[in-house]
Each structure stands twice: as C-alpha cells, then as structure tokens.
C-alpha cells in the first residue's frame, strides 16, 4: 500500500540517522543579545543525521521521494531530517513598556522525521 | 526580533534554490503497479534545491538553524528543502470488493520551504 511502514532502526550505525540533538547557543550566537533578557543561553534541540531509505518517513510523499531518489539520485534528493514537532520556549524580552514574557512555539524541535 | 523576514530571492542563481519541480513517475517506479489502476503515470511535484542563509525559512527554528550552521557547520546542518503544503491526489485502486477511489493528502507537494 501507499502507507508502507517507515522503519525505525538505523542501518548506518548508532547516531548516524535522523535524530534529535541538543546544541547550546548563546543569544550572541542567535543575534538576539540586545532584546532577549532571559534565558541568555538556550538548549536548542535540532534534527540532525541522514535519512536512509524509508527511515522515519514523515508521510507518503517522503516514502515516494526515498524510492525515486534510489532510481534517479541526480534528479530527486533523498528525504532530509527535519522537525516533526516543537517544544514551546518562553523568553523574557525588553519592550517599550518594560519587560514582556513571550512564548515561541516553533523555536526548539521536539521530534524529528525524514521529509 | 526572532522573526527576521525569510528572504525570497535566490543568491545562488536561477533554479538553484529550494523550489517545486515536477518529476514523472510510473506506478512501476513507485512499486504500486499491482494495486493502483489509475493513473498509470503520476506527475509528482517535489521540493528540490539548496537552502542558503534565510532563504524561504519555514519558521524561527529554521532561521536559527541557518544562523548556527554558519557558526558551526560541522555540528549544525543547513536547513533543507521540504514541502510546506500538499495537493491531494485521487487514485483508483483494486480492493477485495472491486475498485475503490481514494484520496491521498500527502503525496504531491504544493509548496516548498527551508526547514
């Protein structure tokens, strides 16, 4: 069927396939130093690693893409590892009227898949 | 601010950056020839191309990823070109009781962005 099961075991060896990894970043790294007050350092979960055939396929499109990449690697790219969901992050920042608390819903990845 | 505007002009030259491209595929290519009756050939729109800094950023996470990739290219991958939306496709396929029409919502890409 169109919905072949995406596979979850990495054929490339431990840590090589699409997964979540934490990257420490300062506000200076992000260019936000002048307006975010806290936290000054963020634990940024990001999606890294390769997407071998049918590994963690996001959907039918990704499964097709994986298959066509096998047939036409120069024309169709392999699926790549991107966030499937996000964890909201709360930042305190300076505003004209003082300090504001704001939530960013799309800043830190919570899960990854191959799309 | 966290929401810097994603840029839409490709600095790499025409056709090099993330965009939608049509790929012709037969049911044999997809491995569906034994259960899909029609269409026998599909026009599959796929997302291809590179994601230079801040080009068509999907969201804040993608903007951060682009920035950190610039600082730590070995640790943080560049954003990659994936579907932002899909076009439903209707396939006619064989079932135990005859022939059925089924809509696939996530088969053909409609738009692309860098995630």
């Amino acid at each position: 069927s169109a919905h072949a099961h995406p596979r979850d075991s990495c054929p490339l060896g431990p840590g090589r396939c699409c997964h979540l990894e934490t990257v420490q970043a300062t506000l200076e790294d992000l260019g936000w130093s002048d307006w975010v007050l806290s936290p000054r350092q963020l634990q940024l979960s990001m999606c890294v690693g390769e997407c071998p055939h049918l590994y963690r396929s996001a959907n039918t499109h990704a499964q097709i893409k994986a298959r066509l990449h096998g047939l036409q690697p120069d024309k169709v790219p392999a699926p790549c590892c991107v966030p499937s969901s996000y964890t909201p992050v709360v930042l305190m920042h300076r505003t004209d009227s003082g300090v504001s608390l704001q939530t960013y819903d799309d800043l830190v990845a919570r899960g990854c898949h191959c799309a | 601010s966290a929401h810097a505007h994603p840029r839409d002009s490709c600095p790499l030259g025409p056709g090099r950056c993330c965009h939608l491209e049509t790929v012709q595929a037969t049911l044999e290519d997809l491995g569906w020839s034994d259960w899909v009756l029609s269409p026998r050939q599909l026009q599959l729109s796929m997302c291809v191309g590179e994601c230079p800094h801040l080009y068509r950023s999907a969201n804040t996470h993608a903007q951060i990823k682009a920035r950190l990739h610039g600082l730590q290219p070995d640790k943080v991958p560049a954003p990659c070109c994936v579907p932002s939306s899909y076009t439903p496709v209707v396939l006619m396929h064989r079932t135990d009781s005859g022939v059925s029409l089924q809509t696939y919502d996530d088969l053909v890409a409609r738009g692309c962005h860098c995630a």
């Epitope: 007050l37 806290s38 936290p39 000054r40 350092q41 963020l42 634990q43 964890t87 909201p88 992050v89 709360v90 930042l91 305190m92 300076r94 003082g98 300090v99 504001s100 608390l101 939530t103 830190v108 | -």
Partner: antibody, heavy 118, light 107 residues
Framework: QVQLVQSGAEVKKPGASVKVSCKAS????????INWVRQAPGQGLEWMGW????????AYAQELQGRVTMTTDTSTSTAYMELRSLRSDDTAVYYC???????????WGQGTLVTVSS | EIVMTQSPATLSVSPGERATLSCRAS??????LAWYQQKPGQAPRLLIY???TRATGIPARFSGSGSGTEFTLTISSLQSEDFAVYYC?????????FGGGTKVEIK
C-alpha cells in the same frame, strides 16, 4: 547541579523592611532570571515578581509595586528581594525560583519564613 | 490578570486509584501551563510544563492534558507519596498566576 540557597528566617515588626537573599550555584548566574514567589501560612502560591540577573530589568506584581525591590549581585551570584512597610499579611514563606526556557521551573530555593508581628 | 481556578479543592482517593485534577483559566493561556506538587514544609516540585510534558525524573503515572482554558492533571494510580497539594500555574502572561490548589488526601 543547580542550587538556590536562601537566607534564614526573619521576625519583623509592622512597618519595618526585610531583605531576603538567594545564593545561586551550579549554573551561569546571569544567564537566567529569578522569580520570587510567596506563600502565606496554609494558603496558595503568589508570584511577586521577576528580575533579569543579566540586566537588572524587573517586572513586579501590581499589588506590590512601590513596596518591593528586587536586585542581583553578579559578583556573588546572589539575588535579593526587599519588602518594605511590612504588614501582618506579609507573613509568609518567600521562595526564589530560577527561570527556565520552558516556563515552569524545577529550581526553587528552600524558602525563607518571614513573620511580621508586633 | 489571568485567574486560575482549581477543582475540587479537596480530593479523597484510595491508594492505587486514579485521580483527576482540573484547572481552568479565565482566558486562554495556550499550552503555557505547569503543574506543581507540594508537601508540607517543602518547596513546590515541578511535575508538568507545557501542559503535557513531564519534567525530568517525574514518574509516568503523572500526565497532563488540555490547552486554552481547560487543563487536567491525571495520576493514574496513586502511591502513598502522591498525597499532597497540587497547584497549576500559567506563564502565558505577566503576572504569573497560580490556582488555589487541590489537596489530594487518603480516603
């Protein structure tokens, strides 16, 4: 590991002031803000305000505005909360609570009991 | 300010039973809600943040759900150490506000 250690219990007369300290360790002090939360005996939790350990910017609960001052000393990684013109209904356990990037916080001081009594 | 209302004020449950605690916000707080557990003489302990994410080290019997204005904390099978007061907290807007608490006691 992250630790917040607060100063000891205080007994004050109405109209006096109290200054509670909160010494932080186990993390870079100026990377996170500090909230102050209080709890009157047998009552719920009340947020008093927040201070950026990086810049000193503050946000106070409206009902305490003018009576409360929050400060930090980055050289000693210590946050302070001063409450003036004390009244009997200020009798409470006062907690310092470190920010996290996810909103809720697992990092609380042990609490400081302030008793206001004539 | 956003008013957080918890119900019931007291919940009597037998060990091993399921406990369901409710928290309602006077306006939407999205998913910016935390749950804390507090035992006598102790500081509150974070259980859940983001309405449904368990904090580090919190047992799987604790689960949170809801978004907007209606939230639930469920303790699937109460252990003796779970009898305590539970508070919800919104951090969508300043001032940060807490619910009045639900005391979970032994039936």
């Amino acid at each position: 590991q992250v630790q917040l250690v607060q100063s000891g219990a205080e007994v004050k007369k109405p109209g006096a002031s109290v200054k509670v300290s909160c010494k932080a360790s186990g993390y870079t002090f100026d990377s996170y803000g500090i909230n102050w939360v209080r709890q009157a005996p047998g009552q719920g939790l009340e947020w008093m305000g927040w201070i950026s350990a990086y810049s000193g910017d503050t946000a106070y609960a409206q009902e305490l505005q003018g009576r409360v001052t929050m400060t930090t000393d980055t050289s000693t990684s210590t946050a302070y909360m001063e409450l003036r013109s004390l009244r009997s209904d200020d009798t409470a356990v006062y907690y310092c609570v470190r920010d996290t990037q996810y909103g809720g916080s697992p990092y609380w001081g042990q609490g400081t009991l302030v008793t206001v009594s004539s | 300010e956003i008013v957080m209302t918890q119900s019931p004020a007291t919940l009597s449950v037998s060990p091993g039973e399921r406990a369901t605690l409710s928290c309602r916000a006077s306006q939407s707080v999205s998913s910016n809600l935390a749950w804390y557990q507090q035992k006598p003489g102790q500081a509150p302990r974070l259980l859940i943040y983001g309405a449904s994410t368990r904090a580090t080290g919190i047992p799987a019997r604790f689960s949170g759900s809801g978004s907007g204005t209606e939230f639930t904390l469920t303790i699937s099978s109460l252990q003796s150490e779970d009898f305590a007061v539970y508070y919800c907290q919104q951090y969508n807007n300043w001032p940060i506000t807490f619910g009045g608490g639900t005391k979970v006691e032994i039936k």
